[in-house]
């Protein structure tokens, strides 16, 4: 009785169970009743990641430095290669198959977390008590200066853009 | 690069026996079932015998049932066919070829058998 | 058993012509697991067309197989000098055995 399920790592082919290819080969021939399933190893530029039944293997992924694509990790017979994006520049993607420059946080942002290779730059309002001057994909928010650690006092509130202002006491006159 | 090579052949009176081998180089012998394929002088392709990749599966030709037997060492990558009891009808050029589904993708150059008293 | 049957059995042609062989079975080829092939004096067979219509490796596409069930074709699209040789069927779905047709001679006219 022919079979109409197989079990794992084979396939179903004209009645007949096969076992697939490993990981790193392509088929090549089913199997017959006399022979097992012919498979090849992928070319040095292809990969296949599965147990597989493919008659062709993929293509590594290029990381076209053109995108500003580098390799992080150079594809293997079972892995593809993996790209990350240059200084500067993240994904745009999961797949990661173009970069774009790390957002700058506004003043009255600060810098959340870095931006890596694969993330953007996540950014924060400046809660009170701090500000952000500047325009940056660096700069966290800053506290506001302690005029009273200086014997100074406030002169100018600060706001999420600005620091306080600190000067001297008013002398009071005898 | 992918070779079977036949020997054994020659020339035997009827009734007596001999012994076919095919060498095969430049692919995983161990992986692929064989094939005894004859051919009579002036005459088409007849198939003989098969035996699956690990030994265990063998089929015949009516003609050739009970007096042949295909047989293979995997350790030294050769097929072999013993026959017995010949006839002067088994005269023929003995080709070994490797089964796929595909059909039979390489053959050797074949070696001549001739029964004759 | 499936008995192969060829036909013609010799074909004369000029070279740049057209070859059509003929193979009739006598019940159906499961999977069209039907083979094609070539063989020339003193030479051994040479694997052309599988499975009814696939071109094995390195044979050029003037070689073509078609049909299914028990009715199939072998066609030389422009005959070539090296074309000019003996063409064998063989089904290898219903075994055993596995059956070669009687072979049709390709020769010049």
């Known amino acids: 009785e022919p079979p109409t399920a197989c079990r794992e790592k084979q396939y179903l082919i004209n009645s007949q169970c096969c076992s697939l290819c490993q990981p790193g080969q392509k088929l090549v021939s089913d199997c017959t009743e006399f022979t097992e399933t012919e498979c090849l190893p992928c070319s040095e530029s292809e990969f296949l990641d599965t147990w597989n039944r493919e008659t062709r293997c993929h293509q590594h992924k290029y990381c076209d430095p053109n995108l500003g694509l580098q390799v992080q990790q150079k594809g293997t017979s079972e892995t593809d290669t993996i790209c990350t994006c240059e200084e500067g520049l993240h994904c745009t993607s999961e797949s990661c198959e173009s970069c774009v420059p790390h957002r700058s946080c506004l003043p009255g942002f600060g810098v959340k977390q870095i931006a890596t290779g694969v993330s953007d730059t996540i950014c924060e309002p400046c809660p009170v008590g701090f500000f952000s001057n500047v325009s940056s994909a660096f700069e966290k928010c800053r506290p506001w200066t302690s005029c009273e650690t200086k014997d100074l006092v406030v002169q100018q509130a600060g706001t999420n853009k600005t620091d306080v202002v600190c000067g001297p006491q008013d002398r009071q006159r005898a | 690069q992918v070779q079977l090579v036949e020997s054994g052949g020659g020339v035997v009176q009827p009734g007596r026996s001999l012994r076919l081998s095919c060498a095969a180089s430049?692919?995983?012998?161990?992986?692929?079932?064989m094939h005894w394929v004859r051919q009579a002088p002036g005459k088409g392709l007849e198939w003989v015998a098969v035996i699956s990749y690990e030994g265990t599966s063998k089929y015949y030709a009516d003609s050739v049932k009970g007096r042949f037997t295909i047989s293979r060492d995997n350790s030294k990558n050769t097929l072999y066919l013993q026959m017995n009891s010949l006839r002067a009808e088994d005269t023929a050029v003995y080709y070994c070829?490797?089964?796929?589904?595909?059909?039979?993708?390489?053959w050797g150059q074949g070696t001549m058998v001739t029964v004759s008293s | 058993e499936i008995v192969l049957t060829q036909s013609p059995g010799t074909l004369s042609l000029s070279p740049g012509e057209r070859a059509t062989l003929s193979c009739q079975a006598s019940?159906?080829?499961?999977?069209?697991?039907l083979a094609w092939y070539q063989q020339k004096p003193g030479q051994a067979p040479r694997l052309l067309i599988y499975g009814a219509s696939s071109r094995n490796n390195g044979i050029p596409d003037r070689f073509s197989g078609s049909g299914s069930g028990t009715d199939f074709t072998l066609t030389i699209s422009r005959l070539e000098p090296e074309d000019f040789a003996v063409y064998y069927c063989?089904?290898?779905?219903?075994?055993?055995?596995?059956?070669f047709g009687g072979g049709t001679k390709v020769e010049i006219k």
């Open positions: 070829a490797r089964d796929t589904s595909r059909g039979h993708d390489i």
């Open positions: 063989q089904q290898y779905s219903d075994y055993p055995p596995f059956t």
């Open positions: 019940q159906s080829v499961s999977y069209n697991y």
């Open positions: 430049g692919f995983t012998f161990e992986k692929y079932g």
